[in-house]
């Protein structure tokens, strides 16, 4: 897996009028890292793990850069000619990667109302667009605007490529990137459900990456899907993830049930507390 830095900016228009403010999210190696809220951009570390390692200078720099990018994206949205009434969104996703062989990748992607219409390889400047005529019309419109803007401001796309990689390298150097695997903490609890039944819940937390298998077994055999309830795998605010699985069992049969967990090639079983 390459190391990656991903900027996701969204601006909105209502009845053809571009709204002030924007939403920005930054992911580092796939984990929520920074966020700017709509009206007042203040880059916020997503969880203690980021705040502990990076100082105020980082947040100031990211705030300044994201604010500038948000302003540029609002101007781009204002130039989209075919805006109908109602709410519309323009989203820019910029990604850079450093691979194990030290080769790099950088790209930006534009979405209008959630539909991809234009991409650019920032390292080579190659533009690509989907085949649909609506996407191509939008793409030409936005491309021409970006081209004119770049000529006026003398800012070229290789600068974006260099800047993104520079930030990623800075974050990697600072040690903010978590090691590739963090095993989960698994905790099994029980609660009364109805007369003669109990609900047993198995929680896994603090794990990375997010892919995990969590299920209940009876006498070593997995229970059917429809007898178990799963929670979503959600970020826990510390750059790691959490999830849960629950099932209803007969009181007195607890010793027959175990929670099975598999994560990054490791697995374990956890009994129901008596």
């Amino acid at each position: 897996e390459p190391h990656s830095l991903r900027y996701n900016l969204t601006v909105l228009s209502w009845d053809g009028s571009v709204q002030s403010g924007f939403l920005a999210e930054v992911h580092l190696d796939g984990q929520p890292f920074l966020r700017c809220d709509r009206q007042k951009c203040r880059a916020k570390p997503q969880g203690q793990w980021a705040e502990d390692v990076l100082g105020n200078k980082t947040w100031d720099r990211e705030t300044r850069d994201l604010t500038g990018n948000g302003k540029d994206l609002r101007m781009t949205l204002a130039h989209i000619k075919d805006q109908k009434e109602g709410l519309h969104s323009l989203q820019e996703i910029r990604v850079c990667e450093i691979h194990e062989d030290n080769s790099t990748r950088s790209s930006q992607h534009f979405y209008y109302d959630g539909e991809l219409f234009l991409s650019q390889n920032l390292e080579t400047e190659e533009w690509t667009m989907p085949q649909s005529s609506r996407a191509q019309t939008l793409a030409m419109n936005v491309r021409n605007f970006l081209k004119e803007d770049a000529m006026k401001t003398k800012t070229h796309y290789h600068a974006m490529h260099a800047d993104c990689l520079q930030e990623l390298r800075r974050y990697l150097k600072s040690g903010v990137v978590l090691r590739r695997t963090v095993p989960p903490m698994v905790n099994v609890t029980r609660s009364e459900a109805s007369e003669g039944n109990i609900t047993v819940t198995c929680r896994a937390s603090g794990f990375y990456p997010w892919n995990i298998t969590l299920s209940w077994r009876q006498d070593g055999v997995s229970l059917s899907h429809d007898t178990q309830q799963w929670g979503d795998v959600l970020p826990d605010g510390n750059g790691t993830y959490q999830t849960w699985v629950a099932t209803r069992i007969c009181q007195g049969e607890e010793q027959r049930f175990t929670c099975y967990m598999e994560h990054s090639g490791n697995h374990s079983t956890h009994p129901v507390p008596s």
């Epitope: 390459p2 691979h99 194990e100 062989d101 080769s103 790099t104 990748r105 390889n121 390292e123 080579t124 400047e125 190659e126 533009w127 690509t128 081209k147 770049a150 070229h156 796309y157 290789h158």
Partner: antibody, heavy 115, light 108 residues
Framework: QVQLQESGPGLVKPSETLSLTCTVS?????????WNWIRQPPGKGLEWMGF???????KYNPSLKSRITISRDTSENQFSLKLSSVTAADTAVYYC????????WGQGTTVTVSS | EIVLTQSPATLSLSPGERATLSCSAT???????FHWYQQKPGQAPRLLIY???NLASGIPARFSGSGSGTSYTLTISSLEPEDFAVYYC?????????FGQGTKLEIK
């Protein structure tokens, strides 16, 4: 119809500078695409040397970086290659080509480095 | 840099047979930046397949391409006499752009 045509001396002395020009017709080099130089030594494979993009950005193969310069003349719709301090290893057929997936090529020009 | 390795180096087949040429990369490549070329003696290469699977203008349908990540394939379903040539793969994901060393397709 897009056409590319290389021109320049076919013989260059060792340690001198190789200079080639690619003239493009049927498409403006400032509209889009990268405008590349690619070479092929006798009996060998293809080597990408570098490009100048529609925006004027240049990118070079690191193996040549200290010796190569690619520039453009937008008024003439041409782009050029300069390769300094040449040796016999630079003897090759030199092609200019358009794009990133190179969809149009010149016919190539043979450059021999010899005293 | 991303190194592309083509296999086999030489492929000896007869007209009418199916040809399968492979190209392997040292690092993952986006499929939209992967292309194939054909070169005949004394001629410039010509674009055959762009963005992994799209036929370039004027290329017959017996040519097809597939692949993703680090592994790509060019297939010629039924060889015609004019298909015997050298084939190169190329990546445009990252600088420097690189070519494979070529596969020579020769008549058996």
């Amino acid at each position: 119809q897009v056409q590319l045509q290389e021109s320049g001396p076919g013989l260059v002395k060792p340690s001198e500078t190789l200079s080639l020009t690619c003239t493009v017709s049927g498409y403006s080099i400032t509209s889009d695409y990268a405008w590349n130089w690619i070479r092929q030594p006798p009996g060998k494979g293809l080597e990408w040397m570098g490009f100048v993009s529609y925006s004027g950005t240049t990118k070079y193969n690191p193996s040549l970086k200290s010796r190569i310069t690619i520039s453009r003349d937008t008024s003439e719709n041409q782009f050029s290659l300069k390769l300094s301090s040449v040796t016999a290893a630079d003897t090759a057929v030199y092609y200019c080509a358009r794009g990133y997936g190179f969809d149009y090529w010149g016919q190539g020009t043979t450059v021999t480095v010899s005293s | 840099e991303i190194v592309l390795t083509q296999s086999p180096a030489t492929l000896s087949l007869s007209p009418g047979e199916r040809a399968t040429l492979s190209c392997s990369a040292t690092s993952s490549i986006s499929s939209i930046y992967f292309h194939w070329y054909q070169q005949k003696p004394g001629q410039a290469p010509r674009l055959l397949i762009y963005r992994t699977s799209n036929l370039a203008s004027g290329i017959p349908a017996r040519f097809s391409g597939s692949g993703s990540g680090t592994s790509y394939t060019l297939t010629i379903s039924s060889l015609e006499p004019e298909d015997f040539a050298v084939y190169y793969c190329q990546q445009g994901t990252t600088i420097p752009f690189t070519f494979g060393q070529g596969t020579k397709l020769e008549i058996k």
